[in-house]
């Protein structure tokens, strides 16, 4: 069966900046800003776009050792990210996968709202365990607040322009943004 869940949470960080940090560079940021939640993120295959497989490892003491995520969609225009948990963690005899969608929407006060939808695909007639949904939400909240704190403490991060050389680009010297840098290196 399929079970849908939805949560909304707010952030003081503007949508574009939060998308860059939390979504596009989460692989690098999470182990740095929340080592108690995530120990490492490893790219197994792909370049960050749809089809990319990532292995997220958790520190000792947490219930699961790792999960593997598959990237389904990265929408840079609408700040939307779709991915699925396809292996490890809770995936097993009763749970086939968890599909997730994160949308970051700008708010008039300069902050943002994160709309998070989770779709649990269970095997047969199995139900979804409430504590598992709760743990997943708590993990997401932990990561978000850690990234938020980092961004508040580092006002230049993920919003400044950088001068990069022609060796980096394989072309002429250009002034490009963090987002362009991410596209260049990861897509």
């Amino acid at each position: 069966g399929v079970f849908n869940y939805e949560t909304e949470t707010t952030s003081v960080i503007p949508a574009a900046r939060l998308f860059k940090a939390f979504i596009l560079d989460g692989d690098n940021l999470f182990p740095k800003v929340a080592p108690q939640a995530i120990s490492s993120v490893e790219n197994i295959e792909g370049n960050g776009g749809p089809g990319t497989i990532k292995k997220i490892s958790f520190p000792e003491g947490l219930p699961f050792k790792y999960v593997k995520d598959r990237v389904d969609e990265v929408d840079h225009t609408n700040f939307k990210y779709n991915y699925a948990v396809i292996e490890g963690g809770p995936i097993g005899d009763t749970l086939e996968k968890i599909s997730n969608e994160i949308k970051i929407v700008a708010t008039p006060d300069g902050g943002s709202i994160l709309k998070i939808s989770n779709k649990y695909h269970t095997k047969g007639d199995h139900e979804v365990k409430a504590e598992q949904v709760k743990a997943s939400k708590e993990m997401g909240e932990t990561l978000l607040r850690a990234v938020e704190s980092y961004l508040l403490a580092h006002s230049d991060a993920y919003n400044e322009q950088k001068l990069i050389s022609e060796e980096d680009l394989g072309g002429e010297q250009k002034l490009i943004s963090e987002e362009d840098l991410h596209h260049h290196h990861h897509h």
Epitope: G1, V2, N4, E6, E73, A84, E96, S99, E101, H121
Partner: antibody, heavy 119, light 108 residues
């Protein structure tokens, strides 16, 4: 403008088979889950089956499980419903419906194709 | 599965009047996963409301949705001639996705 056009309906005997098609246009088909919903003559709506973006997850109503198969061809912007072992109670207008993207409400519908199962 | 029961089965009203349609779920519909559709004779259903109370694009503001848990309502504040139709509620919190049996709003 989103357009969904169903075809393949017709008269079939109990135990027979039919394959319905739905041609989609006006949106990026591969980015959306798709569904079949049916409506028996003079009756209400009944969800039949769902297929997610890249066909890696499929779900069926208990009433059709094991008899119907939903599939899609993202290259052809097409959705299909293979119906086997048809019963008289499968007689209905079959609608192809587009999901809003991630959750399961239907923001666009085709006009339907009529399947009549009768001897 | 979640069973949705709509009432009344038929509502006879005049244009300009207010219509209140009820949809009751056999168990709680999580996270407001409830939609309303309108269907006219010979036509496909049309999405009106999703997420209990969010109007779909192009839907007039005389249509509004409300409720939570197991009890939901669709309200049409001033009935226009084109509003006479059958209305269905649908839950999408868990599969199988289910519809109510419909409420027919007819001209008195």
């Amino acid at each position: 403008e989103v357009q969904l056009v169903e075809s393949g309906g017709g008269l079939v005997q109990p135990g027979g088979s039919l394959r319905l098609s739905c041609a989609a246009s006006g949106f990026t088909f591969r980015n959306y889950a798709m569904h079949w919903v049916r409506q028996a003559p003079g009756e209400g709506l009944e969800w039949v089956a769902a297929i997610y973006r890249n066909s890696d997850s499929i779900d069926y109503a208990d009433s059709v499980k094991g008899r119907f198969t939903i599939s899609r061809d993202n290259a052809k912007n097409s959705l299909y419903l293979q119906m086997n072992s048809l019963k008289t109670e499968d007689t209905a207008l079959y609608y192809c419906a587009k999901d809003e993207g991630f959750l399961e409400y239907f923001d666009s519908w085709g006009q339907g194709t009529l399947v009549t199962v009768s001897s | 599965e979640i069973v949705l029961t709509q009432s009344p089965g038929t509502l006879s009203l005049s244009p300009g009047e207010r219509a209140s349609l009820s949809c009751r779920a056999s168990q709680s519909v999580s996270s407001s996963f409830l939609a309303w559709y309108q269907q006219k004779p010979g036509q496909a259903p049309r999405l009106l409301i999703y997420g209990v109370s969010s109007r779909f694009i192009g839907i007039p503001d005389r249509f509004s949705g409300g409720g939570s848990g197991t009890d939901f309502t669709l309200t049409i504040t001033r009935l226009e001639p084109e509003d006479f139709a059958v209305y269905y509620c649908q839950q999408y919190g868990r599969s199988p996705w289910t519809f109510g049996q419909g409420t027919k709003v007819e001209i008195k």
